[in-house]
Interface confidence: low
Amino acid sequence: PHLRTFTDRFQTCKVQGAWPLIDNNYLNVQVTNTPVLPGSAATATSKLTIIFKNFQECVDQKVYQAEMDELPAAFVDGSKNGGDKHGANSLKITEKVSGQHVEIRAKYIGTTIVVRQVGRYLTFAVRVPEEVVNAVEDWDSQGLYLCLRGCPLNQQIDFQAFHTNTEGTGARRLAAASPAPTAPETFPYETAVAKCKEKLPVEDLYYQACVFDLLTTGDVNFTLAAYYALEDVKMLHSNKDKLHLYERTRDLPGR
Amino acid sequence: SPCKILKCNSEFWSATSGSHAPASDDTPEFCAALRSYALCTRRTARTCRGDLAYHSAVHGIEDLMSQHNCSKDGPTSQPRLHTLPPAGDSQERSDSPEICHCEKSFHKHSATPNYTHCGLFGD
């Protein structure tokens, strides 16, 4: 999936299986990514687990779990708030669109999380105070925490190189790691550009991610995934000048 | 059956006296009844998988909300146990007056914390 880190780095990660996105004293978020096509390097998020840790007299530990085709509007225990404690309503789930869009507000840590199902896959966005991000007991153990550190170099796809290579060709090749030859017919480059332009008129990294996803999978739902990801940034990012990210130097692939 | 959708339905019908086409001046009350109905369906969601009435209700509530221009946030027609939180950029606003430090414990050192964002999407 495409990752925008806390430090506004933009990467395309091919990480498969379960990986931690966030891990601190208050909150643990883990995603499971699966290949979008058999044998493909590109992966998308098929499962998301969020653990709100027990906090003083505010909230009991609560676990939220979403999977493909299952975006509940409740924690796994069926509740919609922080439990039986005095401040239980400082943690709340709101269903914005049934089965498609859920918002979780953890006011006791000033955090808002947006989870969506777009097409078959999940998207995740969070707004969190730096103070919470930094509330970690043991920094040495924070090695593979994607939102903070990004994904390892060997797990990144240089989708901008792919973008450059495929311009005008309609090719399906995925730089150093191509999707399975059995991939369904994908879009010609021009069609992908047109579809992405429709939803994402600014040619930023969200637009480029959209083009990459259409060329890789042929699944138009990924256009919406990029669109909603940008919409969530607009709602959640505190620096309105940093809504759009653009291609910078080539030292960090996909940044 | 643990699925309480028929209870939700009957509460909605009681609240609206069976009217699906309220006069324009009834719309706020109708919207409040719809929001209560939506809340009721959400509370019974986990026990209603596969229940035809539940899925009909969920789709229908969305239809009716848009038909009558009801906002998703706002008062409900039952006691306001869980009004939806205000949308947008207002993470620090309190939902209810009785919650004290649980609302603000994360920024005890600074009036307005520095927020940061992380997102994951697509392939």
């Epitope: - | 059956s1 028929l6 899925h55 009909s56």
Partner: antibody, heavy 120, light 109 residues
């Protein structure tokens, strides 16, 4: 125009399976459930079950549990009903019907019907 | 044996009113707002005439009306016309089952 178009007539032997399709057009397929109803010759209507194309959730009539499978393909807006271990009493016209969207339940649009004949 | 009981047939002259009853239990009809009625002409697919006991979809003439008393729902056709000759089925949704009546043949004399 909202329409449900069903597959053509089938003749099957006892013990076999039949799969009837129902292609929807003119509306958002995932916004409405699909019910299946059958009618034996000269008899009344008999409800078989329901599927939500949105979630894939199904709800089958008790007496058909284990023999009926309802599926949908949202990419083609098509619902399918498969009935296995066919017997002569399964000879009937099989209808698909759209479940009206709302906090109300009814079948507001029907397919033209598919005659399934089970005969040795 | 249907879960909802309807008379096998009713008849009336053009212009007259006829009423078809549909009797069930408290859970299938009495407490249900999900009672609908369908018209079926020979060799044709059923057509929705009423839903939620009393509501008429657009395109259905206002001579068709519905009501419910206790565990019995009723469909009334007032000002009977030749094209109303058909089979009529009541349907109720109860719990997780959809129940059909046995059907009533309406004959226009």
């Amino acid at each position: 125009e909202v329409q449900l178009v069903q597959s053509g007539a089938e003749v099957k032997k006892p013990g076999a399976s039949v799969k009837v399709s129902c292609k929807a057009s003119g509306y958002t397929f995932t916004s409405h459930g699909i019910s299946w109803v059958r009618q034996a010759p000269g008899q009344g209507l008999d409800w078989m079950g329901w599927i939500s194309p949105y979630s894939g959730n199904t709800n089958y009539a008790q007496k058909l549990q284990g023999r009926v499978t309802m599926t949908t393909d949202t990419s083609t807006s098509t619902a399918y009903m498969e009935l296995s271990s066919l017997r002569s009493e399964d000879t009937a016209v099989y209808y698909c019907a759209r479940v009206g969207s709302g906090p109300y339940y009814y079948m507001d649009v029907w397919g033209q019907g598919t005659l399934v004949t089970v005969s040795s | 044996q249907s879960a909802l009981t309807q008379p096998r047939s009713v008849s009336g002259s053009p212009g007259q009113s006829v009423t078809i009853s549909c009797t069930g239990t408290s859970s299938s009809v009495g407490d249900s707002i999900y009672v609908s009625w369908y018209q079926q002409h020979p060799g044709k697919a059923p057509k929705l005439m009423l839903y939620d006991v009393t509501k008429r979809p657009s395109g259905v003439p206002d001579r068709f009306s519905g009501s419910k008393s206790g565990n019995t729902a009723s469909l009334t056709i007032s000002g009977l016309q030749a094209e109303d000759e058909a089979d009529y089925y009541c349907v109720s949704y109860a719990g997780t089952d959809t129940l059909f009546g046995g059907g009533t043949k309406v004959t226009v004399l």
